[in-house]
């Protein structure tokens, strides 16, 4: 059985200010179980965007219904963004541990750029 | 407004204990990493520690094996325990929140921990 | 480990006239460079970032400059709110994160 891929297809995507912007990313499988993770930028100090399991995201919706069963679409939509949302956003795949989830797979990056407001 | 308060520091002895705490608000604190970054008096700036969104955690060398960071989402709070301080650890504390692209944008006004005999 | 020298240590100056600070990286660090402002008893403030970029609030008399290992931070006509201590910091993803020893900017 090959191992999970996480899929981001866009390297870039550039949206303007006060639009939404959808971040795309699939799963190539289903195991191992374990939430899915959307991160602006790849290091230490990494910003949550999504979490799949818990959390307050009030900008954020799910492209699709990630509880539907056999879901491998993580995609997501940012609504009303501004320069201050540009970077690079990270789809991650955690697998179920305890007492913590632990990080299996990162997709490679969408670099999101935000253009001026059209007049 | 994002606001960051520090409290716990104090005078205490080499070899003892002092627990730092932050409390966070004006932002969803669970989202960030956050850090604490000390000042020894009339000295730069030294980065102490990290804890990630994800509750990963890393330490300056001077302080590994004797600081442990730890945060608490459910009360917005970040906290330093420091063990076996020395005198060279004698410091303001400042808890600092960290952005994705590794900047400081929010510092709190810090905690002076003093180690004295 | 990256080492970041700022120079000069101090700098001696009147409000009205230009400051120049500089922060030498002991190896390339493309743009990620950071400057923070620290006044007496305050904690440090956010000025620029990847080099050139002034954060939110922040008067276009601070300007930042360089690329590779050698880093400037101009701030032209000195206010008096101005004198303080300047860090350089390297935005690198990963800690240790590396400040610079500081310049004071001081009224002559």
């Known amino acids: 059985e090959d191992e999970l891929q996480v899929i981001q297809p866009e390297k870039s995507v550039s949206v303007a200010a006060g639009e939404s912007a959808t971040l795309r990313c699939a799963m190539t499988s289903l195991i191992p179980v374990g939430p899915i993770m959307w991160f602006r930028g790849a290091g230490a100090g990494r910003e949550l965007i999504y979490n799949q399991k818990e959390g307050h995201f009030p900008r954020v919706t799910t492209v699709s219904e990630l509880t539907k069963r056999n879901n491998l679409d993580f995609s997501i939509s940012i609504s009303n963004i501004t320069p201050a949302d540009a970077g690079t956003y990270y789809c991650v795949k955690f697998r179920k541990g305890s007492p913590d989830d632990v990080e299996f797979k990162s997709g490679a990056g969408t670099e999101l750029s935000v253009r001026a407001k059209p007049s | 407004d994002v606001q960051l308060v520090e409290s716990g520091g104090g005078v205490v002895r080499p070899g003892e204990s002092l627990r730092l705490s932050c409390a966070a608000s004006?932002?969803?604190?669970?989202?960030?990493?956050m850090n604490w970054v000390r000042q020894a008096p009339g000295e730069g700036l030294e980065w102490v520690s990290l804890?990630?969104?994800?509750?990963?955690?890393y330490y300056a060398d001077s302080v590994k094996g004797r600081f442990t960071i730890s945060r608490d989402n459910s009360k917005n709070t970040l906290y330093l325990q420091m063990n076996s301080l020395r005198a060279e650890d004698t410091a303001v504390y400042y808890c600092a929140k960290v952005t994705w692209n590794n900047l400081f944008d929010y510092w709190g006004l810090g905690t002076l921990v003093t180690v004295s005999s | 480990e990256i080492v970041l020298t700022q120079s000069p240590g101090t700098l001696s100056l009147s409000p009205g006239e230009r400051a120049t600070l500089s922060c030498r990286a002991s190896q390339p660090i493309d743009s990620y460079l950071a400057w923070y402002q620290q006044k007496p008893g305050q904690a440090p403030r956010l000025l620029i970032y990847?080099?050139?970029t002034r954060a939110t609030g922040i008067p276009d008399r601070f300007s930042g400059s360089g690329s590779g290992t050698d880093f400037t931070l101009t701030i032209n006509r000195l206010e008096p709110e101005d004198f303080a201590v300047y860090y350089c910091q390297h935005q690198y993803d990963w800690p240790p994160y590396i400040f610079g020893g500081g310049t004071k900017v001081e009224i002559k």
């Open positions: 990847n080099t050139v």
């Open positions: 804890i990630s969104v994800t509750a990963t955690t």
């Open positions: 004006g932002f969803t604190f669970s989202n960030f990493a």
